[in-house]
């Protein structure tokens, strides 16, 4: 991760003291089940959850160095329908593979301005950011 | 949301200027598909994704006022196996309903101390926090 300037530092405080990114060793924030190679519409009998699912998905990286987390991953469904539990390799049109969305809290860095309008380092702006977490096998909606 | 003290404020800066929580109107951070009432092991034909899934789940609130986000939701599977696509109510033992986990970036507030050890407001400490996002229908692992 690139090191961001301090969060509007006050005199004599190093930015590390103000907003400690690195208190916990932080690996790249990719899902444990990240697998870019499983691109076929099948449910594997081993491997990570996204490849064993009957609504399998892959992950797509979304990197923004002015955002925290800088790396987010979006799920992308590999099949329109669910894969049969009998074989794991042919589709069952009675089920749809649908994306599960979530509004995640993220922070964007932007310039902080003092009372006189002068630049005073960076502030963090909290935002909700829509990410797709996974693909889920659902029964199709019955329209009333 | 309760208002947190500033991120180690420098003289003359209001905390709102330093770390703007409220730039975007922020509703409670609950998933769009939140449903505490769907506690039966069945796949509905309407309603939110977590109740239409053949691996249905409910959400459990995890609130911590010293963390951002203060409210997180953990998925809890309602069935050990997947629900049949045919009936939406019988279980199909050929599929397991498994939790999908994710290490989410969160921030904890804690006292900031100056060089002389005196209290200087609050700092944010970045952490990874394990949350369960959803339940996914998977084919059981084949042991080699």
């Amino acid at each position: 991760y690139s090191h961001w300037p301090s969060c509007c530092p006050s005199k004599g405080y190093p930015s590390e003291e103000l907003l400690r990114w690195s208190t916990v060793p932080v690996p790249p924030l990719k899902p444990a089940s990240l697998d870019f190679h499983s691109v076929s519409c099948r449910a594997s009998e081993d491997g990570p959850l996204n490849s064993r699912a009957i609504s399998p998905w892959r992950y797509e990286l979304d990197r923004d160095l002015n955002r925290l987390p800088q790396d987010l991953y979006h799920a992308r469904c590999l099949c329109p329908h669910c894969v049969s539990l009998q074989t794991g390799s042919h589709m069952d049109p009675r089920g749809n593979s649908e994306l599960l969305y979530h509004n995640q809290t993220v922070f964007y860095r932007r310039p902080c301005h003092g009372k006189k309008g002068n630049h005073k380092g960076y502030c963090l702006e909290r935002r909700l950011y829509r990410v797709s977490l996974a693909c889920v096998c659902v029964r199709p909606r019955v329209m009333g | 949301y309760s208002h947190w003290p500033s991120c180690c404020p420098s003289k003359g800066y209001p905390s709102e200027e330093l770390l703007r929580w409220s730039t975007v109107p922020v509703p409670p951070l609950k998933p769009a598909s939140l449903d505490f009432h769907s506690v039966s092991c069945r796949a509905s034909e309407d309603g939110p994704l977590n109740s239409r899934a053949i691996s249905p789940w409910r959400y459990e609130l995890d609130r911590d006022l010293n963390r951002l986000p203060q409210d997180l939701y953990h998925a809890r599977c309602l069935c050990p196996h997947c629900v049949s696509l045919q009936t939406g109510s019988h279980m199909d033992p050929r599929g397991n309903s498994e939790l999908l986990y994710h290490n989410q970036t969160v921030f904890y507030r804690r006292p900031c101390h100056g060089k002389k050890g005196n209290h200087k407001g609050y700092c944010l400490e970045r952490r990874l926090y394990r949350v369960s996002l959803a339940c996914v229908c998977v084919r059981p692992r084949v042991m080699g």
Epitope: C41, R42, S84, L85, Q86, T87, G88, S89, H90, M91, D92, P93, R94 | S84, Q86, T87, S89, H90, M91, D92, P93, R94
Partner: antibody
Framework: QVQLQESGPGLVKSSETLSLTCTVS????????WSWIRQPPGKGLEWIGF???????NYNPSLKSRVTFSVDTSKNHFSLKLNSVTATDTAVYYC?????????????????WGQGTLVTVSS | DIVMTQSPDSLAVSLGERATINCKSS????????????LTWYQQKPGQPPKLLIY???IRESGVPDRFSGSGSGTDFTLTISSLQAEDVALYFC?????????FGPGTKVDIK
């Protein structure tokens, strides 16, 4: 009436690749699932895997690392390749069609079989 | 994998008598949502490929004589030949198609006593 016919060499050297083709007549290869099954002399049946006309495959985990299926819809045939063969791969190899249940969207039993071809692996 | 076992390994029955073959699966192959047992029976005569007799545990394939019947549910299944004929001398296999890999029983040899 659907008929299946296996073809390929009856003798394969150890460590080499066994190659067989199944030709379907009296019906289209499309819209069905097609399997390979083998039977060592005097023994039981072992399912090797299936292929769909689209090329989607499913292999028995016990043979997955050595087996490859392919399909040619224009010639109405599908093929099996089994590499690094040993004497234990000596068997009668059958191709067969899966019954498909359109109500459950699942594969049923094997309703049509080829006559089978004996493949012997020699050292 | 689901393991299929058959008993007996072989049996000899007089012409016109009943022959019973048992098949057991290592796990349940009944799907409650459809109330179907994913089990089939095949007959194999020497030098020939297997021939489909029974599917969904009890449904007779068209053209199969009605002396052949299948029964059972869950993990225990039976093929019955109510009145054995000379042409019924063969090897009989059960097979599950509940989940891949599809697996066969070892076979039961039926002879005339």
């Amino acid at each position: 009436q659907v008929q299946l016919q296996e073809s390929g060499p009856g003798l394969v050297k150890s460590s080499e690749t066994l190659s067989l083709t199944c030709t379907v007549s009296g019906g289209s290869i499309s819209s069905y699932y097609w399997s390979w099954i083998r039977q060592p002399p005097g023994k039981g049946l072992e399912w090797i895997g299936f292929i769909y006309y689209s090329g989607s495959t499913n292999y028995n985990p016990s043979l997955k690392s050595r087996v490859t299926f392919s399909v040619d819809t224009s010639k109405n045939h599908f093929s099996l390749k089994l590499n690094s063969v040993t004497a234990t791969d000596t068997a009668v190899y059958y191709c067969a069609r899966h019954y498909f249940d359109s109500g459950t969207y699942e594969l049923g039993p094997f309703d049509y079989w080829g006559q089978g071809t004996l493949v012997t692996v020699s050292s | 994998d689901i393991v299929m076992t058959q008993s007996p390994d072989s049996l000899a029955v007089s012409l016109g008598e009943r022959a019973t073959i048992n098949c057991k699966s290592s796990q349940n192959i009944l799907l409650t949502s459809s109330n179907k047992n994913y089990l089939t029976w095949y007959q194999q005569k020497p030098g020939q490929p297997p021939k489909l007799l029974i599917y969904w545990a009890s449904i007779r394939e068209s053209g199969v004589p009605d002396r052949f019947s299948g029964s059972g549910s869950g993990t225990d299944f039976t093929l019955t030949i109510s009145s054995l004929q000379a042409e019924d001398v063969a090897l009989y296999f059960c097979q599950q198609y509940y989940i891949t890999p599809f697996t066969f029983g070892p076979g039961t040899k039926v002879d005339i006593k």
